[in-house]
Interface confidence: medium
């Protein structure tokens, strides 16, 4: 090509038009272009409709192009990655109609001051959203409702003073949240929900340590190993966790997680944390929380880091959490991490009703009610949008699982209420090794047999049981890949998808969730 550099790598035809002083799309680009770099040009305005002839285009880099306006006409139905970082956009274009397959959107370092409620409507495939370095002060409560597959969210370096309580609702795949360098003074109660967030960046905010901060303090205590400090130019895998980086602004940089909360209201004599723990729909009996539903949590994603294996957790409904595929060359604005393939532990659990003290870390996860896909904003020219009609009896969830091309994953399905234990495949045979002893009712750390070869020692110092719980050795038979999740009725059977030898399991292996 006379203007741009064209190269073919594997199945991609990459066209590099960076730094060409272009004011418009060059003519006669190869029609089978899959990756188009238009960075560091002087486009000022750009119409996505000009790219409609490029029906294989999956990546578009428009960063550093002095863009003040992006026209979202036409449809690019296969575009997966759009980089609009380092431009002059003052409002986020409504991309849902034009880019229905978008999975990565980078609008970092623009001039966004607010986001309308429907800003992300129609972007149901979005997995990574980067809004770092804008001028956002507030966010609409339902901003992320249309993006249930979101895995990475960066809101760092904005002017946010508060966050909507339900911002992260339904984001079961979220593994990275960057909120550093804002003007946040508190975190609303229940903000983080109950799923583990492996990578959280929260430093550089003026946290106000008073009684309102106690929910956040408790979350920091429970997730200390997942709180990191962002360092520009340092790979996220080389960062070390530092919960002390989250500091009280009104108390000489005292770490929030150590804030004593003296004088704050308490419930009885159990300590001041109870009032600020978030246990949705719990059924309290005096100072106990009764588990009325069995939901088993187990690790589903390993994170390769120098500090060991980290696992994000999903409920027994086997929600899909596929790791995102990342481009080999990361740009500095993209705070991304690479994760190896999912795995499911190889064990069978037989659960019975258990009473917990209220002290242990809550992992309650309200079962989300399925929703149909979000409506799409005003139609682009020449296209008409129709929404699926929800069935009154079995509504289809918006969030669907993310199977890799080689390993189909089970589709997400709510875990049914446990009735009688009923194995999904074959019942577990009698263990050849002696059956593990029930978990005692005193505060100890029981050892749990898994696959008879690997040991898990959960931190269960707060556990008090009314009935014994036994973990049986799992079946040696590998469960085949499933298109549909197994029906879980008190029994969970998993298997290791890769051939790795018994990776170390996270010690916070959790058992039941109170309602």
């Amino acid at each position: 090509h006379p203007i741009c550099e064209v190269s073919k790598v594997a199945s991609h035809l990459e066209v590099n038009c960076d730094k060409r002083n272009l004011t418009a799309l060059p003519p006669d680009l190869p029609k089978d272009t899959t990756i188009l770099h238009l960075s560091e040009n002087l486009l000022y305005t750009f119409s996505l409709a000009t790219l409609m002839p490029y029906t294989r285009l999956t990546q578009l880099n428009l960063d550093r192009c002095e863009l003040t306006k992006l026209q979202v006409d036409g449809t690019l139905p296969v575009l997966g990655t759009l980089d609009l970082s380092h431009n002059q956009l003052q409002s986020l274009p409504l991309l849902g109609q034009t880019l229905p397959a978008l999975t990565v959107l980078d609008v970092s370092f623009n001039r966004l001051t607010s986001l309308p409620l429907g800003a992300l409507r129609g972007l149901g495939e979005l997995q990574e959203l980067y809004l770092k370095g804008n001028e956002l002060k507030t966010l609409p409560p339902g901003l992320l409702t249309p993006t249930p597959k979101l895995e990475k969210l960066s809101l760092a370096n904005n002017n946010l003073t508060e966050l909507p309580a339900g911002l992260l609702n339904g984001l079961e795949n979220l593994d990275t949240l960057l909120l550093q360098e804002n003007s946040l003074y508190t975190i609303p109660k229940g903000f983080f929900g109950s799923h583990l967030l492996p990578f959280a960046f929260l430093h550089g905010n003026p946290w106000l340590c008073n009684c309102e901060i106690l929910y956040f303090r408790r979350w920091l205590q429970d997730n200390a190993e997942n709180v990191y400090v962002w360092k520009q130019g340092v790979d996220v895998k080389a960062m070390t966790s530092n919960v002390a980086s989250v500091q009280c602004d009104n108390s000489d940089k005292f770490p929030v997680y150590k804030y004593p909360g003296k004088g704050c209201p308490t419930l009885g004599d159990e300590g001041d944390t109870d009032l600020y723990d978030y246990y949705p729909e719990e059924d309290t009996e005096g100072d106990k929380v009764r588990a009325t539903r069995t939901v088993v949590k187990f690790p589903t994603k390993a994170h390769t880091t120098p500090w060991g294996l980290f696992y994000s957790w999903s409920t027994a409904s086997l929600d899909s959490q596929m790791p995102s595929s990342l481009h080999p060359t990361q740009e500095s604005t993209k705070e991304q991490t690479t994760f190896p393939p999912r795995w499911t532990p190889n064990f069978t659990l037989h659960m019975e009703s258990i009473t917990f003290s209220k002290t242990p870390k809550s992992t309650t996860e309200p079962t989300p009610s399925p929703t149909t896909s979000e409506p799409v904003p005003e139609p682009a020219p020449n296209m008409t949008t129709l929404e699926p009609t929800p069935s009154p009896t079995t509504p289809e969830p918006t969030s669907e699982p993310a199977p890799s091309p080689t390993t189909p994953e089970p589709t997400s399905e709510p875990a049914p209420s446990p009735t009688t234990p009923e194995p999904t495949s074959e019942p577990a045979p009698s263990p050849t090794t002696p059956e593990p002893t029930p978990i005692p009712t005193i505060a100890t750390s029981p050892t749990i047999l898994v696959s008879a070869t690997s040991l898990i020692t959960p931190k269960s110092t707060f556990l008090t049981t009314t009935k014994p719980v036994s973990l049986l050795e799992s079946t040696k038979k590998t469960i085949p890949e499933l298109d549909q999740p197994p029906k879980l009725r008190g029994v969970l059977q998993g298997h290791l998808e890769s051939s790795r030898n018994d990776p170390f399991l996270h010690p916070d292996f959790c058992c039941l969730l109170p309602l």
Epitope: T55, R56, G80, T103, S325, L386, P388
Partner: nanobody
Framework: EVQLVESGGGLVQAGGSLRLSCAAS???????MGWYRQAPGKQRELVAY???????NYADSVKGRFTISRDNDRNTVSLQMNSLKPEDTAVYYC????????????WGQGTQVTVSS
């Protein structure tokens, strides 16, 4: 690599109907799917697509006549074409959007639809 195989094309009189099907070799429930068409001497044109969540979108020229649907259990996406017109004559290509922004787009080999007047 995912293989997409179209079927159902053929010769039909104006006003008639055809149903195109596209079968994928692997599970595709996560991906948006759709149909393009290309008439001789013309650019490839987007006809319809359906997202993984079930939202559908149609070109103005086919709205009210064409219906796209997907069956995730069978890994198929279909295009029901009613009230066909001669200008619908083209090679129809099924496509599968990328799983992530760094994946390729997968295309079928195309199936010929000819509408005679």
């Amino acid at each position: 690599e995912v293989q997409l195989v179209e079927s159902g094309g053929g010769l039909v009189q104006a006003g008639g109907s055809l149903r195109l099907s596209c079968a994928a070799s692997e599970t595709f429930s996560i991906r948006a799917m759709g149909w393009y068409r290309q008439a001789p001497g013309k650019q490839r044109e987007l006809v319809a697509y359906i997202t993984s969540g079930g939202s559908t979108n149609y070109a103005d020229s086919v709205k009210g006549r064409f219906t796209i649907s997907r069956d995730n259990d069978r890994n198929t996406v279909s295009l029901q074409m009613n009230s066909l017109k001669p200008e619908d004559t083209a090679v129809y290509y099924c496509y599968q959007a990328p799983r992530s922004g760094y994946d390729p787009v997968y295309w079928g080999q195309g199936t010929q639809v000819t509408v005679s007047s």
